[in-house]
Structure formats: structure tokens, C-alpha cells
């Protein structure tokens, strides 16, 4: 079992969606889980977020806000074997440029 490299960082505007993928070469039904290391808090173990979905073990975070910032790590495990872990992707949340208050839609804070 081996894992493809993941991006070192991901920048997402406030209120948008973040997609993290965990590509791996497992042909079996590997178990993908996602974990987060919080800003300035590198204690172990990290916070468990939930399972990945689809063949790439995708983690979707809708409606991103500042509190979502941190390092996102996926783990892939086949059966009872020891898991492989990604190096982690750092999520940076940026404030989008101001827009008219009434212009709210799929890609905005109320999404």
C-alpha cells in the first residue's frame, strides 16, 4: 500500500468549500479516515474528523470558516495492516474581497 503526494497547502475563501483528496493505490476497500492538527497545537493524537468518501477518500468541508484552519492528514488502512499516513495539507482560510450584501449564492458564506 502506498499513497500519492498531497498538496502541502490549500487556500480557500471564507464560506467556500474545501476538498481534500487522499489518493492511494489500494485495490481493496481500504479504510480512509481524516484527522486534523489544530493551529499551534501539535499534540498527538490529532482530532478525528470522519471517514473519507468516494474512491479518493475525499474529505469535503462546506462553508469554511476561520476555525477550520489547520493541518489535515488522511490515514489509509487495509484490513488489520498498519495504516499509511499522508504528510498533511495545511488549510488556509482567506477573507474574500467584499461583495454587495445581497449577492449571496452557492459560493458564499450562507452556502
Amino acid at each position: 500500500l502506498w499513497m500519492h503526494k498531497v498538496p502541502a497547502s490549500l487556500m480557500v475563501s471564507l464560506g467556500e468549500d474545501a476538498h481534500f483528496q487522499c489518493p492511494h493505490n489500494s485495490s481493496n476497500n481500504a479504510n480512509v479516515t481524516w484527522w486534523r492538527v489544530l493551529h499551534g497545537n501539535y499534540t498527538w493524537p490529532p482530532e478525528f474528523l470522519g471517514p473519507g468518501e468516494d474512491p479518493n477518500g475525499t474529505l469535503i468541508i462546506q462553508n469554511v470558516n476561520k476555525s477550520h484552519g489547520g493541518i489535515y492528514v488522511c490515514r489509509v488502512q487495509e484490513g488489520n495492516e498498519s495504516y499509511q499516513q499522508s504528510c498533511g495539507t495545511y488549510l488556509r482560510v482567506r477573507q474574500p474581497p467584499p461583495r454587495p450584501f445581497l449577492d449571496m449564492g452557492e459560493g458564499t458564506k450562507n452556502r
Epitope: L49, G50, I60, M104, G107
Partner: antibody, heavy 121, light 113 residues
Amino acid sequence: QVQLQQSGPELVKPGASVKISCKTSGYAFSFSWMNWVKWGPGQGLEWIGRIYPGNGDTNYNGKFKGKATLTADKSSNTAYMQLSSLTSVDSAVYFCARWVYSGNNYAVDYWGQGTSVTVSS
Amino acid sequence: DVVMTQTPLSLPVSLGDQASISCRSSQSLVHSNGNTYLHWYLQKPGQSPKLLIYKVSNRFSGVPDRFSGSGSGTDFTLKISRVEAEDLGVYFCSQSTHVPPYTFGGGTKLEIK
């Protein structure tokens, strides 16, 4: 795989309340909006509202404010909708649904099997 | 709120024929980010709705290529090139550009002639 499992059919009396559950698995529950949709006889589909389990934020269709209350329990990955002061017009099938339309060519769309609510004396 | 108007209400077809359903919105569905969040669903009797097309023309995973979506701004069309028995049901368009609330069209019932 992603699953949304709703509670069973309900037969309730006018004026009463009912609470429908939507138990989820297979994704990170806290980070996706959970939507609720009404499918009434001859009424088509109506969006009731949504909840973001991570922080409890809710948005409601104005038509259902005061009628529906959305909650979520992160510990059990379950979303709930309570309908109050029920009348015959509330008789319908109610769906929980998770959808994402983002990225250039990316979509996620999962619905519960539906919960039938019948209001009758 | 954005009002979605579908036509026709009922569409009788013969198997193998082409079917076309129209959806019109009360305001443009082009979002400021350039995307158009117009989607098509099929609901069969006793089932939950199933996503067919998202963002005007993108087929959802597992949807046969006989389904296609087109349109822009306020006018959109779903086409089924060769209708099969499993395609029968009620088709809904939906918008998620101006939300909340998400809004749906009134539905078009595809039935055998």
C-alpha cells in the same frame, strides 16, 4: 459508502408534533450542510431548510419558519427535524439530503429514503 | 425567491423517442463566480430524487449519456435522446445560485404515450 437512514412512517393527530431523524454514515458529518425537503401530494419538492452540524447554523425557507426546527447531534452523526402544530397540509414525505455542487466538475448528492408523515384524527 | 417554471407539466412519449423538458427561472442563475447552479433530478414513484445533471450540463456519476442538459441565464433544457422504460417518472429542475432558499421547478411527468 455514504448513507442517510431516516426514521419510520408517522401517523399523528392534528395539533401534535413529530420529530424525524436522519442517521448518517460514510462521511464527515460535521462539515456538510444537511438539507430537509418536503414532497407533498401534488405539491412537488419544497426545500424546508438546512443545518450545519459543525456549529449548529441553520437557514430556513420562510414558509417553514415556526413549523420546522432543525437540530443535529454530532456524537451520533444524526440530524433531526421537528414539525409542530401539525395540520393536514403537513401530510407529506420528508427527505433529508446532502448535496455539494462545487469545483469545476464535482458533485455529491445523497438523499434519505424519506419519512411519510400522515396527519389525521 | 427565485421561481422555477417547468414545461410541460406532462410529457407523453413513446419508448425510443426523444424527450425535451424546459425550465425557466425568474432571474438569471449565473453566479458572480461564473458558475450556473442549475440541476436536474428524476424522482420515480416511492423513491427519493436522483441527481441527473448538475451545473447545467454535467452528468452525475452513473447517469447514461442519453441524458443531456443545456441552456444559460434563465432558460434551460433537459433532453433524453432515446427514452427507455426506466426513465419514466417526474423530472425536477433546481437552482442553488441564489440561496437560501433552494428552489425547485413544479415537475414534469414523463409517461408512456
